[in-house]
């Protein structure tokens, strides 16, 4: 039925679109970039990304339409909705603070939650992170007892241990939790780069032509025989 199919008879896909036969008399067009519609008859108005703030663009009859995310309005979703214009968002005397696409309640002492509708209990849940222990110090105050290696009012900061590092023999400090590690140059190993790598064990053929390998701190040397010389007895 190919010669009588609409793809060949009426050539329905416009603007360079490609026609695909789906059945005896149905088809689908794959449009060139910049065109849209069942028959690629419309210019794709979404090509210029007119919709702002994460909204979804659709093209209808050469026009674009933006579906806005909550908190934005306008033809291109470019306008932030000021939720604080509508009273009652924040309970118990909380102050409404407008944010792009949303709002936040700044709660008075004793209240918490998105709408200031929950009673604030300093350590329930605990604001202390990284294993810190919360201790209530007043009706509305707390302090965090941090595990070694952490600091900050909620133990949120890993203390940098590298300023006091003791990496030896050219090792480079890498911070850890209440410790540090040393990235060693090839000739050294161990946590602090204090252990000499035995190159003679690692490279059995380090010395050529019957030369004997002698390990040294931070390197190795070759003892050459039979007139050979050079770093590896190859000369």
């Amino acid at each position: 039925y190919s010669t009588s199919h609409p793809c060949f008879v009426s050539r329905p896909c416009l603007n360079g679109g490609t026609c695909h036969m789906l059945s005896r008399d149905t088809y689908e067009c794959t449009c060139q970039v910049g065109f849209t519609g069942k028959e690629c008859q419309w210019t794709d108005a979404c090509l210029s990304h007119p919709c702002a703030n994460g909204s979804t663009c659709t093209t209808v009859a050469n026009q674009f339409s933006c579906k806005c995310l909550t908190g934005f309005t306008g033809q291109k979703c470019e306008t932030d909705v000021n939720e604080c214009d509508i009273p009652g968002h924040c309970q118990h005397g909380g102050t409404c603070l407008n944010l792009p696409g949303s709002y936040q309640c700044q709660c008075p002492q004793g209240f918490t939650g998105q709408y200031c509708d929950s009673l604030y209990v300093p350590c329930a849940p605990s604001p202390c992170v990284n294993g810190g222990t919360c201790r209530q110090t007043g009706d509305f105050t707390f302090e965090c007892n941090c595990l070694p290696g952490f600091e900050g009012s909620t133990c949120e900061r890993n203390i940098d241990d590298c300023p006091n590092h003791r990496c030896q023999n050219g090792g480079v400090c890498v911070d850890g939790v209440n410790t540090y590690n040393c990235r060693c140059p090839p000739q050294w190993t161990g946590q602090f780069c204090t252990e000499d790598v035995d190159e003679c064990l690692l490279q059995p053929n380090a010395c050529q032509n019957g030369g004997t390998c002698a390990n040294r701190n931070g390197g190795y040397g070759c003892v050459c025989v039979n007139g050979w010389s050079g770093d590896d007895c190859s000369e």
């Epitope: 241990d161 300023p163 006091n164 003791r166 050219g170 410790t179 140059p185």
Partner: antibody, heavy 120, light 107 residues
Framework: EVQLVESGGGLVQPGGSLKLSCAVS????????MEWVRQASGKGLEWVAA??????????VYSASVKDRFTISRDDSKSTLYLQMNSLKTEDTAVYYC???????????WGQGTLVTVSS | DIQMTQSPSSVSASVGDRVTITCQTS??????LAWYQQKPGKSPKLLIY???RLQDGVPSRFSGSGSGTDYTLTISSLQPEDFATYYC?????????FGGGTKVEIK
């Protein structure tokens, strides 16, 4: 043979300044951490300051008791370590030792020490 | 700063005795511990590094052990030249800190 020889100690009044030197030989100076350690008469050892090696950009660390008053430095061309001591206090009175950090997390070579007396 | 607690502060012993000195640190120092010997009017001398490694030229009667926060220096058979003060020192991180010292005296 590794050798460290301190000099520059003496009697100075509180608030005064003094510069200690430590001339080293027998090893490649820039390859090692260098430390100053002091010892008050009849007391234990107290670490004062350190300067890391070339591989660690000669970075410097001080004890809290001397920070902002003492300055450690080195002159590689002269293989000499220095300790500039300003705003001296009576509690800084001690024998000052220069030592080499031998790449083992330990101080494997020490000078003979130089006595600093801070008194009015 | 890492605190070093060395004990005892002094010990009376005789030639041939076995002497044990301990050093406790306020946090794990990953075996970054050294032991020094100091005689009156002299500079300290390194005996042990890395908690258990004998420095070149140091007699084998000296030995070190330990890990984490607990370390020990042992003199297996005390000799006349061993009467001195001994210090432990952590080399894990700055500021370097020393123990208070242990004076080994003749009984």
């Amino acid at each position: 043979e590794v050798q460290l020889v301190e000099s520059g100690g003496g009697l100075v009044q509180p608030g005064g300044s003094l510069k200690l030197s430590c001339a080293v030989s027998g090893f490649t100076f820039s390859d090692f951490y260098m430390e100053w350690v002091r010892q008050a008469s009849g007391k234990g050892l107290e670490w004062v300051a350190a300067q890391r090696n070339k591989a660690n950009d000669f970075s410097i660390v001080y004890s809290a008791s001397v920070k902002d008053r003492f300055t450690i430095s080195r002159d590689d061309s002269k293989s000499t370590l220095y300790l500039q001591m300003n705003s001296l206090k009576t509690e800084d009175t001690a024998v000052y030792y220069c030592s080499r950090d031998g790449g083992k997390l330990a101080l494997d070579a020490w000078g003979q020490g130089t006595l600093v007396t801070v008194s009015s | 700063d890492i605190q070093m607690t060395q004990s005892p502060s002094s010990v009376s012993a005789s030639v041939g005795d076995r002497v044990t000195i301990t050093c406790q640190t306020s946090e794990d120092i990953y075996s970054g511990l050294a032991w020094y010997q100091q005689k009156p009017g002299k500079s300290p001398k390194l005996l042990i590094y890395g908690a258990s490694r004998l420095q070149d030229g140091v007699p084998s009667r000296f030995s070190g052990s330990g890990s984490g926060t607990d370390y020990t220096l042992t003199i297996s058979s005390l000799q006349p030249e061993d009467f001195a003060t001994y210090y432990c020192q952590q080399g894990f991180k700055y500021p370097l800190t020393f123990g208070g010292g242990t004076k080994v005296e003749i009984k």
